[in-house]
């Protein structure tokens, strides 16, 4: 997250981190039920660990943290690497969470976001596009949902109904490492961090997010059948 601020501890209890090796964060994720996460489909890896209830970027133990393995990764069937359409994936964890003030699921919005809606995006991704600057703790940023027209003008030929754009003034954006993390609007999960221009946080190049209202049925059906 570029030019965000430290999230309040436990204010994003649905925020997850996907880790490679012992503690190498590569994507965010969102807890949507006691045993299921959502993340971006482009975050799919054969082996990874899941960390919930953690505030710090560092591997230091925190009392609220819970660690999991992914036992099933189900990318949306319409996703094709390295494209951006249908960029979501369900992850079933090896056990259910212990519900606590640090770890709680978030409800998915059934209605699509409208232009001007204020939302919160969060993550431990890079704080600049130099790729080496990471935050000490989870970062939060208020962003505004942009019109479809403005979104398409920003990225001609690249936007479809499975995406929405959101941003703020130049210099504020999600960035590398935030993928799969939550965009929460009015207390409900509206989107997942997906893509945007590189470097992040450029003028008239907003972040692009997976439009989860288009996938509510697929998410429910997939969870029920697995």
């Amino acid at each position: 997250i570029v030019n965000g601020s430290d999230c309040q501890k436990d204010a994003q209890p649905w925020q997850g981190a996907l880790l490679l090796g012992p503690n190498k964060l590569y994507c965010g994720a969102v807890l949507i039920s006691p045993q299921w996460l959502l993340t971006a489909a482009h975050c799919r890896k054969p082996v990874f660990r899941i960390r919930l209830g953690h505030h710090s970027m560092s591997p230091v133990y925190e009392s609220g943290q819970q660690m999991f393995q992914g036992i099933k990764s189900i990318p949306h069937p319409g996703y094709s690497h390295p494209g951006h359409s249908n960029d979501l994936m369900l992850i079933k964890m090896n056990r259910k969470i212990r519900d606590s003030h640090s770890v709680k699921p978030v409800e998915i919005a059934c209605d699509c976001a409208t232009e001007g809606t204020r939302c919160m995006v969060s993550g431990w991704g890079t704080t600049s596009s130099s790729h080496n600057n990471f935050p000490k703790v989870l970062q939060c940023l208020n962003i505004t949902v942009l019109s479809e027209e403005r979104c398409k003008n920003s990225y001609p030929g690249q936007i479809d109904k499975t995406m929405f754009c959101a941003g703020d003034e130049e210099g504020r954006d999600s960035c590398q490492g935030d993928s799969g993390g939550p965009v929460v609007c009015n207390g409900k999960l509206q989107g997942l961090v997906s893509w945007g221009d590189f470097p992040c946080a450029q003028r008239n190049r907003p972040g692009v997010y997976t439009n989860l209202c288009e996938f509510v049925k697929w998410i429910k059906d997939t969870m029920n059948s697995n």
């Epitope: 482009h42 790729h131 993928s179 997906s194 221009d197």
Partner: antibody, heavy 126, light 107 residues
Framework: EVQLVESGGGLVQPGGSLRLSCAAS????????MNWVRQAPGKGLEWVSY????????YYADSVKGRFTISRDNAKNSLYLQMNSLRAEDTAVYYC???????????????????WGQGTTVTVSS | DIQMTQSPSSVSASVGDRVTITCRAS??????LAWYQQKPGKAPKLLIY???SLQSGVPSRFSGSGSGTDFTLTISSLQPEDFATYYC?????????FGGGTKVEIK
């Protein structure tokens, strides 16, 4: 079959210009970032330039900045390198290479160049 | 710019030998290192990405390790087709930079 084929190399005098092309086939070209990499005779690999899938992000090596221009035409599945003010030290085999990393995607994960062309030779000499 | 230093610059080995090539970055690059193999007159071929992940179709005798600034490419049992030049490349930061190469020759 996934393939990249370069063309446009040749002999050119110092100060002259050349335009290299790279024709892509067997994959969705418009989804991938692309690079030019060169190799001087008997030397190692040197990265020259990068262009994102939508052409919105472009980078150059300092050694070619201001002289070379990378571009692409997704409708034609083609990558280009316009080389102006050529110098003797630009003599090399030039490869186009597909970048497996999408810099637009916001994961923190980087791959490398997974598909390379056979190369085209550029000789700058008087 | 990040400098990539490979060693040794050349190594003589026999079929069946274990060969280790090292690559050092001038600053930390996490695990974002790729290894390539190049044979004379041919284009480079991606062997390993993200320091230790084997590219599809690459034999399992090739392995990579390391993180931060120090990385290693190992060929567990050298085969005749492995005699080539090997390059490391850092991929997270522009300008992309390659190591100087390590030539694996027949002893």
């Amino acid at each position: 079959e996934v393939q990249l084929v370069e063309s446009g190399g040749g002999l050119v005098q110092p100060g002259g210009s050349l335009r290299l092309s790279c024709a892509a086939s067997g994959f969705t070209f418009s989804s991938y970032s692309m690079n030019w990499v060169r190799q001087a005779p008997g030397k190692g690999l040197e990265w020259v330039s990068y262009i994102s899938s939508s052409s919105s992000t472009i980078y150059y090596a300092d050694s070619v900045k201001g002289r070379f221009t990378i571009s692409r035409d997704n409708a034609k599945n083609s990558l280009y390198l316009q080389m102006n003010s050529l110098r003797a030290e630009d003599t090399a085999v030039y490869y186009c290479a597909r970048d497996l990393t999408s810099m637009q995607s916001r994961d923190y994960y980087y791959y490398g160049m997974d598909v390379w062309g056979q190369g085209t030779t550029v000789t700058v000499s008087s | 710019d990040i400098q990539m230093t490979q060693s040794p610059s050349s190594v003589s080995a026999s079929v069946g030998d274990r060969v280790t090539i090292t690559c050092r970055a001038s600053q930390g690059i996490s695990s974002w290192l790729a290894w390539y193999q190049q044979k004379p007159g041919k284009a480079p071929k991606l062997l390993i990405y993200a320091a230790s992940s084997l590219q599809s179709g690459v034999p399992s005798r090739f392995s990579g390790s390391g993180s931060g600034t120090d990385f290693t490419l190992t060929i567990s049992s050298l085969q005749p087709e492995d005699f080539a030049t090997y390059y490391c490349q850092q991929v997270p930061i522009f300008p992309y930079t390659f190591g100087g190469g390590t030539k694996v020759e027949i002893k």
